[in-house]
Interface confidence: low
């Protein structure tokens, strides 16, 4: 008879944990390392948590070590650590701080939780900060302290001083942009208002501290910008304040942004600032809120796409069955990782259920939006017919969806730099999100799409995105479904004998590995974690040779190539060859500057998109109180000026020359 | 085409303060920042800082905040420079210059008692 | 502050023959945006200085041919085809990239 063909996926460890925590938190030390570190607790939203469980694996997660018996207080005090969270050093992946719920103790590891010491602290640290460079430097702050205190610790949280009170946030500062051990603090005022303050010597010296900006009702850090937002009494107005976003750009002073609306101003939210642009959603009164984007400097801000999604404790949304589940602000606003200028947003028509709910995309950073084209057939092959024309497209789940579908908690869009133009979404073809969810992968950075498993399933890749895998939500199943072509086609892996009830599926972050790990639990009444690992390096079967590999550029839904001005052209393997890409692959990336078309604009301060999306043209935007088109005074006989049609190239757009720039990009005219 | 107009020549007693202009055309005033560069005799170039017309936010090279102060005439789309207890150190050759690609023919500053 | 840094005279060179004048930087000019802010002016003889170059290799309007801009992380050359009696001056790199804007030294183009 026939030898029996080896399966190509190995479970390596199965470890069942006898542990009914609610919750785990799992971290990979990273850095080529073998060292996982999980913390089994329960949810914080429950009443106080009354106990957790640390696991450690130096094997890759093919057995797990429990290690709560180290966490405890010392002689005499039997009482058992209960661990709400544990840090993990960015400047050495050796270290690890483990903090108690409630004590005023916590433990640190120099050496992968081999020895741990604990530390009697003077302050519950509820909110510790690691530095990103500096190994020992750590800040920790206690929010239940009446006075709201801030510590600095310079020996990895073995000892510490308290340098400011009534702090509302803290944080580092962001290499290169400020100076080394910078930090910022909201302090809250007398007034309601907060202050924020930068200082590069902990507060010690009133000449290394420099406020930034007064009667602050919130503040954000993000790499190059700083964000906060003011409450502006309007004398002699029917409405008693108003909202300014204030922004700074490469830590210049603080300016009031400007923004073209006419509609008060309730909250801003900070959806993206990581391209030199920003997209900030504008809550209204009216409980409707707008997408803005900014030049490169964060100051003037044009309407992008109007009703998205935004969801706000106490603002918009927040009369729904949401505010159960969500105490922090979001939008459902995807930026497509490993490209640029790419995101998924949802738009929003009336009250927040799923049959209001419509996807959008943008290919040149909300210069123009597009609904999803729904793919042209089912995962079996039968044809959909779903035509743009006639308002169906595809919808993808994003947060607020998840939020809605708790008992099948949706799994969010799925798009990393280690697999750029690979986006894997939960989603519904139809006039609205309300139809049923399947699994849709784009190759092509969601230019198109297809299905690729029928029905809701948590999903994630390895090897840069050369294997797929993906396992059924809502049932007890055994069967991990891969896919090593980028989700054309699956096979079948029998995990274990039993049906397990599973929770998650994760592959070390950076998704470089062929590793991945199921989170379950294999009790039938009771909860009781059990962690399978998984390797699928034999489904690749050999490394890739030059041969494997094609030459791929992302393109809009029209196949144009030149994104930002530019077309991008990275290496990537060809979906039908099976190889494996290896840990340590690096993908080049060629880039080359393409003629200026109208994807390299969107529209000019005080102008906004026609409400007709397909026309793609920028009009006078009616909100806007100036004149649009109106010279400049005085405007000497003689002499000209340039005069705006309604368009500026996005930020970041690199194309030169073609007849629509010269089109586009406004004119000199002569005053009139 | 893009001019700046600025006065060729001042002659003032240390201690006392100068403001010298800076006439744009050909261009809209406010839509281009107005930077002004400082050049000592057989010497190099000194940015001391702009200004934004639109909305007369100013940045300054630390070294000489205190000494210049920009501001802006939108009405006559006009850029000024005061500078301020003046030293035989500030005598040189003041620049505007819009967005660093157009300058001025320069304004010839003369400390001397 | 970026340290710009530049020779204070230029090998002499015969009209018609070529040039190149070198900038040095303490830091990279690259901003996250993929634009490296690097410009060269000339200033000849009692004139006020003109942009040549912008952005490392751009050349500003009204600029012959002849003059061409590269860079090789934070060094960055100025150079000139065939020189013409009208190039003489000096050459100033700048950097535009950060607040203060600061200026080399200046390179003076001496003609043989």
């Known amino acids: 008879s026939a030898a029996l063909q080896p399966e190509p996926i190995k479970v390596y460890g199965q470890v069942s944990l006898n542990d009914s925590h609610n919750q785990m938190v799992v971290h990979w030390a990273g850095e080529k390392s073998n060292v996982i570190v999980a913390l089994a607790r329960d949810s914080l939203a429950l009443a106080r948590p009354k106990s957790s469980d640390v696991y450690v694996s130096y094997d890759y997660g093919k057995s797990f070590k429990k290690i709560s018996d180290k966490l405890n207080f010392g002689l005499g005090n039997r009482s058992e650590a209960v661990i709400a969270q544990f840090y993990h050093s960015p400047a050495d992946n050796k270290r690890y701080i483990f903090a108690d719920a409630y004590a005023q103790y916590l433990w640190i590891t120099f050496d992968f939780c081999n020895t741990l010491q604990g530390f009697s602290i003077p302050f519950r640290a509820a909110d510790l900060l690691l530095h990103s460079k500096a190994s020992n430097l750590l800040l920790g702050f206690d929010r239940s302290h009446p006075n709201k205190q801030l510590w600095k610790s310079d020996d990895f949280g073995q000892t510490w001083i308290m340098i400011q009170e009534h702090v509302k946030s803290f944080s580092w500062g962001i290499d290169p942009y400020d100076k080394p051990n910078t930090i910022y603090i909201e302090r809250h005022e007398p007034s309601g208002y907060s202050t924020v303050f930068r200082s590069t010597d902990f507060f010690q010296s009133r000449e290394n501290q420099e406020v930034i900006l007064e009667e602050v009702r919130d503040f954000q850090l993000r790499d190059k910008y700083m964000f906060a937002t003011k409450v502006v009494h309007l004398l002699g107005s029917e409405q008693q304040s108003s909202v300014q976003l204030w922004v700074s750009f490469g830590r210049k002073p603080m300016r009031a942004a400007q923004f073209v609306t006419r509609h008060p101003i309730n909250e801003y939210y900070i959806a993206d600032a990581s391209e030199d642009q920003v997209f900030v959603c504008v809550s209204h009164s009216n409980n409707r809120t707008n997408l803005y984007i900014s030049e490169a400097e964060g100051l003037k801000f044009s309407l992008s796409l109007e009703n998205v999604l935004y969801y706000s404790p106490g603002g918009a949304g927040s009369d729904t069955l949401v505010r159960y589940f969500a105490n922090e602000p979001f939008a459902d606003f995807h930026r497509v990782e490993g490209l640029q200028g790419v995101y998924i947003a949802t738009l929003i028509n009336g009250s927040m259920n799923e049959e209001n709910m419509r996807s959008v995309i943008t290919f040149d950073k909300g210069g123009t939006w597009e609904f999803l084209q729904a793919p042209a057939f089912t995962g079996y092959g039968e044809k959909i017919n779903c035509e743009l024309s006639q308002g169906c497209s595809l919808h993808l789940a994003q947060r607020l969806s998840q939020l809605l579908n708790l008992q099948l908690r949706r799994m969010p869009i799925l798009s990393k730099e280690s697999a750029p133009g690979l986006i894997i979404a939960t989603g519904s073809v139809g006039k609205n999100l309300a139809s049923k969810t399947n699994v849709y992968i784009s190759s092509s950075a969601g230019a198109r799409w297809r299905e690729a498993l029928p029905g809701p399933h948590y999903y994630t890749w390895g090897d840069h995105g050369g294997i797929i895998t993906a396992i059924a939500q809502g049932m007890e199943t055994n069967e991990l479904k891969y896919s090593t072509n980028e989700g054309e086609t699956w096979k079948t892996f029998i995990f274990s004998e039993k049906p397990v009830f599973v929770y998650g599926l994760l592959t070390e972050p950076g998704e470089k590995s062929t590793v991945f790990t199921i989170f379950g639990s294999n009790k039938e009444n009771v909860h009781s974690w059990l962690i399978l690992q998984v390797n699928a390096t034999d489904a690749l079967g050999v490394p890739c040779t030059e041969n494997d590999y094609k030459l791929w550029s992302p393109s809009d839904e029209r196949g144009n190539e030149c994104l930002l001005g530019h077309k991008t052209v990275f290496k990537r393997r060809t979906p039908h060859a099976t190889c494996f890409n290896g840990e340590d692959f690096d993908r080049p990336v060629v880039v080359s500057n393409c003629s200026c078309t109208r994807e390299d604009y969107e529209c000019d301060f005080g102008f906004k998109m026609s409400e007709d999306l397909s026309l793609e043209v920028c009009v006078p935007d009616p909100e806007f109180s100036g004149k649009s088109y109106s010279p400049p005074v005085p405007c000497p006989v003689g002499s000209t000026y340039r005069r705006t049609r309604g368009y500026r190239k996005i930020s970041g757009d690199t194309c030169s020359g073609g007849d629509v720039e010269a089109r586009l990009e406004g004119e000199l005219v002569p005053c009139p | 085409q893009v001019q700046l107009q600025q006065p060729g020549a001042e002659l003032v007693k240390p201690g006392a303060s100068v403001k010298m202009s800076c006439k744009a055309s050909?261009?809209?005033?406010?839509?281009?920042?107005m930077h002004w560069v400082k050049q000592r005799p057989g010497q190099g170039l000194e940015w001391i800082g702009t200004i934004d017309p639109s909305d007369s936010y100013t940045s300054y090279n630390q070294k000489f905040k205190g000494k210049a102060t920009l501001t802006v005439d939108t009405s006559s789309s006009t850029a000024y420079m005061q500078l301020s207890s003046l030293t035989s150190e500030d005598s040189a050759v003041y620049y505007c210059?819009?967005?660093?690609?157009?300058w001025g023919q320069g304004t010839s500053v003369t400390v001397s008692s | 502050d970026i340290v710009m840094t530049q020779a204070a005279f230029s090998n002499p060179v015969t009209l018609g023959t070529s040039a190149s004048i070198s900038c040095r930087s303490s830091?990279?000019?690259?901003?996250?945006?993929?634009?490296?802010?690097l410009y060269w002016y000339l200033q000849r003889p009692g004139q006020s200085p003109q942009l040549l170059i912008y952005r490392v290799s751009n050349l500003a309007s009204g600029v012959p041919n002849r003059f061409s801009g590269s860079e090789s992380g934070t060094d960055f050359t100025l150079r000139i085809s065939r020189v013409e009696a009208e190039d003489v001056g000096v050459y100033y790199c700048a950097q535009l990239l950060e607040l203060p804007y600061t200026f080399g030294g200046g390179t003076k183009l001496e003609i043989k």
């Open positions: 050909g261009y809209t005033f406010t839509s281009y920042w």
């Open positions: 830091k990279n000019l690259l901003h996250s945006n993929g634009i490296t802010y």
């Open positions: 210059s819009s967005s660093m690609d157009y």
